[in-house]
């Protein structure tokens, strides 16, 4: 068990021309809030699929009113971290969606309105217990800067929060075969209590003798990869009982990585991610000092004068890992805007832009309004080298192709059902409730149990909300 923590540093206009208009105005003050959704693995999932690892909503930020004539600055943010607790093991690879929402606070018709300003998504590898990872994501003309980390909740430790720590029984050292629990040096790793043979890489346990599998693995010892396609034809007598091809052993089965290294499969073999102080193909080389030159790719080694003290590698741009052994996939930050193709040339990033866009990051819209129509009755507004569509009621998005869903913000209270309507939305209230948005129980003590409201109230009728 543990907690994924997200710290939003700034949300504002990205670099380059065509800065976005401020989402708030003197007539319509507003404030921001954020939603994060986490999913295990690196799958390209739809935004609507469940947040299987968890989700969190921030507090509302301070109210912001645009200063007339001033460019849109970074907008005021809510205080505090977004925290997503996870109950089981941390998967190591995960997908995230971070949404920036605007809450309009003016006394406009319809009361407070919620609208999605920006949505960014990505896929990352992250070990629990590591330092904060910084990230920058762009959504249209907006830029979001944030940091994130995963940390284990005691007594869990390790890169997946699956090892357990216990206070030392003896004051000086841990028992035979048990290591100190970094960073809790006054505690010792608890003896392994999982079922014998449970895969240390793909299995974990919370109770003695059990073996629970991480996503993508199955079998009593979590050594069998889950087949992604349904099996139809048997292969010989051995599989006749199931009618499935039984996958062969994976390169990470039995965990070839020593000294607490974690194994990940590669197209041809496997790769070990070693804890600090160990390196080599299987993390088998230990007792490393800076004199051994453990930092690769020009990394600068600090500390580690003797084998008992840890060293730290300060990596040059483009590399990461405890030994600077991994090249950063700088294209994963999606630096190319407007659908440009990202090329990491090693010494530099290059964006190959789609037709109609130019600039180092494809940030310049060459077309402006020329030959660019706004869909669904929207009108094109020129300005700043970028076109903007002013959309007709009920539509939104860059080209007014997205149907704005007035029900997305759950505007009906107490289980009322929301219906989009050409003039706004309609709430059909559950029995015993009334009001434009079903916010008033007719009889508060047991409203939901009422078969009907008193004559004349007809709370089940739709209430028009314009």
């Amino acid at each position: 068990a543990g907690v994924f923590e997200l710290q939003i540093h700034s949300f504002g206009p990205g670099p380059g021309p065509g800065a976005p208009r401020s989402p708030c105005s003197a007539r319509l003050p507003c404030r921001l809030f954020f939603r994060v959704c986490l999913k295990p693995g690196l799958s390209e999932e739809a935004a609507e699929s469940p947040c299987a690892l968890g989700a969190a909503l921030s507090a509302r930020g301070p109210v912001y009113t645009e200063q007339p004539g001033a460019p849109a600055p970074d907008l005021p943010l809510p205080d505090g971290l977004l925290q997503v607790p996870f109950r089981d093991a941390w998967p190591g690879t995960f997908s995230f969606i971070i949404e920036t929402w605007r809450e309009e606070l003016g006394d406009q018709i319809g009361g407070p309105a919620w609208s999605l300003l920006a949505r960014v998504a990505g896929r990352r590898r992250l070990a629990a217990g590591g330092p904060w990872a910084r990230d920058i994501q762009r959504a249209g003309a907006w830029e979001l800067r944030f940091s994130y980390r995963a940390r284990c909740e005691p007594p869990a430790v390790g890169t997946a929060c699956t090892r357990l720590c216990r206070p030392r029984s003896a004051p000086s050292r841990c028992g035979p075969g048990l290591r100190p629990c970094a960073p809790l040096e006054d505690e010792c790793e608890a003896p392994l209590v999982c079922r014998a043979g449970c895969s240390p890489e793909h299995g974990f346990c919370e109770q003695p003798g059990e073996c629970r599998c991480l996503e993508g693995w199955t079998g009593p010892l979590c050594t069998v990869p889950v087949s992604t396609s349904s099996c139809l034809s048997p292969r010989g007598p051995s599989s006749a009982t199931t009618g499935c091809l039984v996958p062969g052993p994976g390169p990470c089965d039995g965990n070839p990585c020593a000294n607490g290294g974690s194994c990940s499969e590669t197209p041809r073999s496997f790769e070990c991610t070693c804890p600090r102080g160990f390196y080599g193909l299987r993390c088998e080389v230990s007792g490393v000092t800076c004199a051994d030159g453990p930092c690769f790719n020009g990394g600068l080694c600090v500390g580690g004068a003797d084998p008992d003290s840890a060293y730290i590698c300060h990596c040059p741009p483009g590399f990461q890992g405890s030994n600077c052994e991994k090249r950063v996939d700088r294209c994963s930050l999606q630096p190319c805007r407007n659908g440009g193709l990202c090329l990491d040339l090693g010494h530099a990033l290059r964006c190959r832009c789609r037709a109609g866009f130019a600039g180092p990051r494809c940030e310049h819209d060459l077309d402006d309004c020329a030959g660019r129509a706004c869909a669904n009755g929207g009108t094109c507004v020129e300005g700043g080298g970028a076109h903007r569509c002013s959309c007709a009621l009920g539509f939104g998005g860059r080209d007014c192709r997205e149907r704005a869903d007035p029900c997305a913000a759950r505007p009906c209270a107490h289980g009322g059902r929301c219906y989009a309507h050409f003039s706004g939305l309609v709430c059909a209230c559950a029995p015993g409730y009334m009001g434009a948005r079903c916010e008033f129980p007719v009889h508060p003590d047991g409203a939901s149990a009422l078969p009907a409201a008193p004559p004349g109230l007809r709370p089940g009728d739709p209430q028009r909300y314009l």
């Epitope: 606070l105 018709i109 009361g111 407070p112 434009a436 948005r437 508060p444 314009l466």
Partner: nanobody, 117 residues
């Protein structure tokens, strides 16, 4: 957290008038839907009138044409103007707020209105 304090209750003769006030301690009253409820002795609490955050209004049939609900967001208040009062209007009147931020209801302590000659 939203705190509600009612005032204006008292004894009035049948046919008389009274105005109830409710002050809300919230920095964003515009994000509240507000209402008045009442509870007569031995009866269930019932909705009298409500005003949504967008200004739309609902009344219970028995008070239509006699009671008027209004709100003043600048003063963080909601009011109930009661005219042509009857003996059956005697009850404890409660202020109610529904927050669209927390999606939670909040109640005041109540103020007693007695209609009697």
């Amino acid at each position: 957290e939203v705190q509600l304090v009612e005032s204006g209750g008292g004894l009035v003769q049948p046919g008389g008038s009274l105005t109830l006030s409710c002050a809300a301690s919230s920095s964003s009253v515009s994000l509240l839907s507000l209402a008045w409820y009442r509870q007569a002795p031995g009866k269930k609490r019932e909705l009298v009138a409500g005003i949504s955050d967008d200004g739309s209004i609902v009344y219970m049939d028995s008070v239509k044409g006699r009671f008027t609900i209004s709100r003043d967001n600048a003063k963080n208040s909601v009011y109930l103007q009661m005219n042509s009062l009857r003996a059956e209007d005697t009850a404890v009147y409660y202020c109610y707020a529904y927050s669209w931020i927390t999606r939670s209801p909040y109640w005041g302590q109540g103020t007693l209105v007695t209609v009697s000659s």
